[in-house]
Amino acid sequence: ARNGDHCPLGPGRCCRLHTVRASLEDLGWADWVLSPREVQVTMCIGACPSQFRAANMHAQIKTSLHRLKPDTVPAPCCVPASYNPMVLIQKTDTGVSLQTYDDLLAKDCHCI
Amino acid sequence: ARNGDHCPLGPGRCCRLHTVRASLEDLGWADWVLSPREVQVTMCIGACPSQFRAANMHAQIKTSLHRLKPDTVPAPCCVPASYNPMVLIQKTDTGVSLQTYDDLLAKDCHCI
């Protein structure tokens, strides 16, 4: 139930995919990743107003209860709905390997 | 990679399962759900400090980048890792039906 994609807070303010450039040092990977030297990290950032990109029934419940009890129940949160794989060249105990990570880069976002 | 389950902020402050009692009116369901009259909604609430219950590599990246750029990159967020199904007795166009919802109640939480 991916509800409305219209952001009532104004363009770009609601939950969506952002790209953040990060070095291996930024990521804390310099000691085990050889390549790439820099990653364009895609991540989900933004507000989740009522029913915006609600991932499922649970997100809809959370929205309702947050409206009633904002100090107890947080608003839904902008998180990845799916991921893009990425391959890293990394140091291993036995040398160097190519390794694919399936859960590294956000592909699509929703509110939950 | 479900990292540490020790909460550095003190007992019960970090991401975990909470139960919130809600009526059909609270949930906005009074016009289409007949039973139950009240739901013990299990949801994920709490802080996600560094590496606490990190769901995957993406969550670990988010932690690192949040530390570097707290105004740009939010901390990981406490969300359901899995759900418990729940059956509702609901009104339909043709009468009344029993319907199972698989994404209504959080079963387990992680940070992402």
Epitope: L34, S35, T42, P85, V87, I89, V96, L98 | -
Partner: antibody, heavy 121, light 107 residues
Amino acid sequence: QVQLVQSGAEVKKPGASVKVSCKASGYTFASYDIIWVRQAPGQGLEWMGWISALSGDTVYAQKLQGRVTMTTDTSTSTAYMELRSLRSDDTAVYYCARTRHDTSGIRFDYWGQGTLVTVSS
Amino acid sequence: DIQMTQSPSSVSASVGDRVTITCRASQGIDSWLAWYQQKPGKAPKLLIYAASSLQSGVPSRFSGSGSGTDFTLTISSLQPEDFATYYCQQVHSFPITFGGGTKVEIK
């Protein structure tokens, strides 16, 4: 513009060694890794190995392990491939190529012109 | 090691023809596949990477598709300069491996 210029053709006797150079220009050498590929006459492409231009870490094809050494010299933006104990079946054109690695994966976007190494008694 | 099998090994075609070359990996390689074109006496040239992304400067008549184990390179309308040998290559794991090549010849 990006260029990889390799050293000239070599004729070697069996048992000898050869060292092929690959000089890079038009980009920051240490930011892109290098692979070496060879092609025997009338045959397909065979990957020989990879070297990090920054750290010098290497990965070699199993069949060449112990006979091949890849190095880089960042001060001259040059990569080297040395092959020892040459045999007649090492006769091939040897290529270096620049490695492009980002979120779209790995590919080899610029290639040297190739160096013909002939092993003959 | 991951084996890459290309078919056909050669194909005869005319200018304007649609040409399809397939590449099969011996195990799943996600979308970590590239296609190269090689002309006699020349170095290989990158055409497609990440299975379907067109390298900058490569004509749009070249396209790639597939993921997992089965991949395709398509030339939508063969041009005179396209007669060459084409290689697929997996960059999923070391050792990096190439297919045996497909020679596109003039009919």
